[in-house]
Interface confidence: low
Amino acid sequence: GWVWNQFFVPEEMNTTSHHIGQLRSDLDNGNNSFQYKLLGAGAGSTFIIDERTGDIYAIQKLDREERSLYILRAQVIDIATGRAVEPESEFVIKVSDINDNEPKFLDEPYEAIVPEMSPEGTLVIQVTASDADDPSSGNNARLLYSLLQGQPYFSVEPTTGVIRISSKMDRELQDEYWVIIQAKDMIGQPGALSGTTSVLIKLSDVNDNKPIFKESLYRLTVSESAPTGTSIGTIMAYDNDIGENAEMDYSIEEDDSQTFDIITNHETQEGIVILKKKVDFEHQNHYGIRAKVKNHHVPEQLMKYHTEASTTFIKIQVEDVDEP
């Protein structure tokens, strides 16, 4: 019968040839009366066999990541008779791994959106590196992830690449962050290779800012001849939030005379002061009203940021018109 052990050849060997092992028949008494032959893909180009001894050699540098095993066939012939001494046999040569591939992030570019003020532990995104080395060969493809840039706001789970929030962030201070993740093979041991990737993390807005008037006092004038419905001026608040979180509604908080109204221009987010009742200079030549401003949409869980509405005082001077 055939006699051999399992065959392994290390990849990326720099020698011209490498002895892998020996294939032989137990009928071979060593008198060179048998001839060994190698058949199959790679026979003669990648592997050769010593016809007399059955020793197998690799004569080419191998790359396990290109091909990890070779299935070959062996024959042994009695030189004198030309007949097969043993039935043809199939055997496998496995290419053993060395750590010659760095981890690579294949799904770049990474981008994630997470709401500002998200609590610690919130999952942001998972980055995954691939290592072309053999996962079953030591630690060549066992990866550990670490954060090179992004502290103290983010953390990464070492074995999964899951990025989480580790500190609350305020979009109004900074609306995006670049996080740099490193993946190291060999579980970080000496000889490890590494790869890095960048993750752009954008903060989406939450309604954590209330609108605030730009001025604490506005001075407006109205002609006593102005009809009801006349726009007599605008007031303006600012809101550090964006989009619908910055949409606001103006209203009268105090107007004893009930002479004025405020409507909101939702295009410009300005408050328009409107004459509700005609004024008479001779009857009253100035008015003082108080206006307030609130956001249009405030989710229940964010009401703590909106406890007291911003107010402003509006002084309105009535202009005299000569009356016949």
């Epitope: 799904d107 997470v114 709401p115 998200s118 609590p119 532990g121 919130t122 999952l123 942001v124 995104i125 998972q126 995954t128 996962p135 066992r142 789970e157 074995t159 999964t160 899951v162």
Partner: antibody, heavy 121, light 107 residues
């Protein structure tokens, strides 16, 4: 096609042990997290345990911590749940579920039909 | 642990009607929420993950929305095969937790 086939359920007395298996096929087993989820008769779903691809991380529900052990054999593409010190409240159908990709790594995208565990004297 | 609360417990609707199922998390889970469908005697089936991404092979009549603590599963027009129990599940924090389920039944 991804397939998950659970086995190992049965009737066991309180305090006894059982080992559940989940044979996986149709995907690279070692690349995905795997989960056990149970469902008591007439009740909702309850997460039991998760193991990450490669087995580096394991997580357990408080109700089973110290009694159940999750493990996997990549060479056999098989997930296991060793259940010790079983109690009546562990009676349920036990499903294994494959994890997903990316932000859904610790999710559950394909489920097995389940194996029934009954703990009773 | 994060408590997931589903409402209503039972939803009685007719074929072709729109179903709106709610799921509330006891604290923000970002968009890390999945919805499952389960029929009697069957394994759960993933419908939605990431709060709004439909799983492979799930019909377009199923849609998910929400983020933070409030989530909704909408079935735009109920088909006979949609009458089942629906569960939401968060995968943002350990332990992973499921809602108690909403049973969608024929009126």
């Amino acid at each position: 096609e991804v397939q998950l086939l659970e086995s190992g359920g049965g009737l066991v007395q309180p305090g006894g042990s059982l080992r559940l298996s989940c044979a996986a096929s149709g995907f690279t087993f070692s690349s995905y997290a795997m989960n056990w989820v149970r469902q008591a008769p007439g009740k909702g779903l309850e997460w039991v345990s998760t193991i990450s691809g490669g087995g580096a991380n394991t997580y357990y529900a408080e109700s089973v911590k110290g009694r159940f052990t999750i493990s996997s054999d990549n060479s056999k593409s098989t997930l296991y749940l060793q259940m010790n010190s079983l109690r009546a409240e562990d009676t349920a159908v036990y499903h294994c579920a494959k994890g997903g990709m990316g932000g859904y790594y610790y999710g559950m995208d394909v489920w097995g039909q389940g194996t029934t565990v009954t703990v009773s004297s | 642990e994060i408590v997931m609360t589903q409402s209503p417990v039972t939803l009685s609707l007719s074929l072709g009607e729109r179903a709106t199922l709610s799921c509330r998390a006891s604290q923000s889970i970002s968009s890390n929420l999945a919805w499952f469908q389960q029929k009697p005697g069957q394994a759960p089936r993933l419908l939605i993950y990431g709060a709004f991404t439909r799983a492979t092979g799930i019909p377009a009549r199923f849609s998910g929305s929400g983020s933070g603590t409030e989530f909704t599963l909408t079935i735009s027009s109920l088909e006979p095969e949609d009458f089942a129990v629906y569960y939401c599940q968060q995968y943002n924090y350990w332990p992973l937790t499921f809602g108690g389920g909403t049973k969608v039944e024929i009126k």
